[in-house]
């Protein structure tokens, strides 16, 4: 490529978090060049002895590439040329965390970032009024979550109070012995307020808010996840 | 300081089993692929088996393949090599040492431990 | 797997001499071989890496060549102290071949 070696481009990489069993990304940007053929995207994991991704000359070079990313991997491949390198990870693993590398080498120079790719599992709750029970109960599930997350009730109308004594969470395992199913129950529920399960982990919070009247129930779920600028 | 001490070596019958391990300490343990080395006496050096930092990815010698399992305990900074159907043939002197941090980057086997010996006889 | 072949199995020499040890592998190996020494009931100790990097505390007497298939450790002036067996490794590929050593022996 014709490159002296003194000069360095910038790479910019945004720490992330992946949910085991889905599709993830780690992003990574840089300064393009004009010429894809001239551009190499080199992806490398911390204490792992082979490659993750290797992009050159316009196509991916996978000779070095470490097993457990085997057919897992990909890059935009149409996007490389305007500085986009982001991978695309498939069917994302626990053992998958870890630091990263993304390395670019174009003819303008060399540059490298590192990113912490966390991964776990985490699902949006969904709260209910639970019919079944013998007092106004709400019933707050989420189907997948890794590692053990806390659960937390809040009112709107008791803001600041705790809800540890009236309320009950259990965490089952799923069948592929990793993630567990959330579940908490909020017992004594009065009518008119507006309720939150807060479920959250080092990876992920998410919130589940129901308001009930007497005329209606109204849901809300939101997931947010932490130590992520995406 | 780097530090490497493996334990767990001994004498062992064929067909026998024996866990090694190596305490590690001076440096961040997860940050590096570790591996297996061995020397049968008076002959050369052979790399038995390595693991990656976080646990994920195993690689062995065709020689040990479905017989050693390598593995980590990251909170532990100790790695294990449990081998089993121990042959005649697996005498040696078994060092662990620090493998890569970075593929392509950095040193490897910068760093072993004094070796523990491991005889497979009846 | 990828096959390492040294050469000489071993050689004498004098305090003061040039000393050149190659190394072969059966498939390209980048430039991703490193270099051993061993004395006896000592752990080996590495001298180069990436095929001519020099690994820090080591003197500059050592030097390593080669990418591909052909490498060679060469010691510009023997001294006392380097009268040990030498060992060449690939690390191109998931294992890590060594070489079955060069035995370096006062002359």
């Known amino acids: 490529f014709g490159i002296s070696g003194r000069h360095s481009i910038t790479v910019t990489t945004v720490a992330s978090a992946g949910n085991i069993g889905e599709d993830g990304i780690l992003s990574c940007t840089f300064e393009p060049d004009i010429k894809l053929s001239d551009i190499v995207i080199q992806w490398l994991k911390e204490g792992v002895l082979g490659l993750v991704h290797e992009f050159k000359e316009g196509k991916d070079e996978l000779s070095e590439q470490d097993e457990m990313f085997r057919g897992r991997t990909a890059v935009f491949a149409d996007q490389v040329i305007v500085g986009n390198a982001s991978l695309r990870l498939k069917n994302v693993q626990l053992t998958d965390a870890g630091t990263y590398k993304c390395y670019i080498i174009t003819s303008k120079g060399k540059g490298n970032a590192n990113l912490e790719y966390k991964t776990g599992a985490f699902s949006m709750p969904e709260v209910n009024v639970d019919y079944n029970a013998s007092s106004e109960t709400l019933r707050c599930e989420a189907p997948r979550w890794f590692p053990q997350p806390t659960v937390v009730w809040a009112s709107q109308v008791d803001q600041g109070a705790n809800f540890s004594e009236v309320s009950n969470t259990s965490f089952e395992l799923n069948s592929e012995n990793v993630t567990m199913k959330v579940v908490s129950v909020l017992y004594n529920v009065t009518i008119n307020n507006t309720y939150s399960c807060m479920i959250e982990n080092d990876i992920a919070k998410a919130t589940g808010d129901i308001k009930v009247t007497e005329s209606e129930i109204k849901r809300r779920s939101h997931l947010q996840l932490l130590n992520s600028k995406a | 300081e780097v530090q490497l001490l493996e334990s767990g070596g001994g004498l062992v019958q064929p067909g026998g089993s024996l866990r090694l391990s190596c305490a590690a300490s001076?440096?961040?343990?997860?940050?590096?692929?570790m591996s297996w080395v061995r020397q049968a006496p008076g002959k050369g050096l052979e790399w038995v088996s390595a693991i990656s930092g976080g646990g994920g990815s195993t690689y062995y010698a065709d020689s040990v393949k479905g017989r050693f399992t390598i593995s980590r305990d990251n909170s532990k900074n100790t790695l294990y090599l449990q081998m089993n159907s121990l042959r005649a043939e697996d005498t040696a002197v078994y060092y662990c040492?620090?493998?890569?941090?970075?593929?392509?980057?950095?040193?490897?086997?910068?760093?072993w431990g004094q070796g523990t010996l491991v005889t497979v006889s009846s | 797997d990828i096959q390492m072949t040294q050469s000489p199995s071993s050689l004498s020499a004098s305090v003061g001499d040039r000393v050149t040890i190659t190394c072969r592998a059966s498939?390209?190996?980048?430039?991703?071989l490193a270099w051993y020494q061993q004395k006896p009931g000592k752990a080996p100790k590495l001298l180069i890496y990436k095929a001519s990097s020099l690994e820090g505390g080591v003197p500059s007497r050592f030097s390593g060549s080669g990418s591909g298939t052909d490498f060679t450790l060469t010691i510009s002036s023997l001294q006392p102290e380097d009268f040990a067996t030498y060992y060449c490794q690939q690390y191109g590929s998931y294992s890590r071949t060594f070489g079955q050593g060069t035995k370096v022996e006062i002359k």
């Open positions: 498939q390209s190996t980048r430039s991703w």
């Open positions: 001076g440096f961040t343990f997860s940050s590096y692929a």
């Open positions: 040492a620090r493998d890569i941090q970075w593929y392509g980057e950095s040193t490897l086997f910068d760093y």
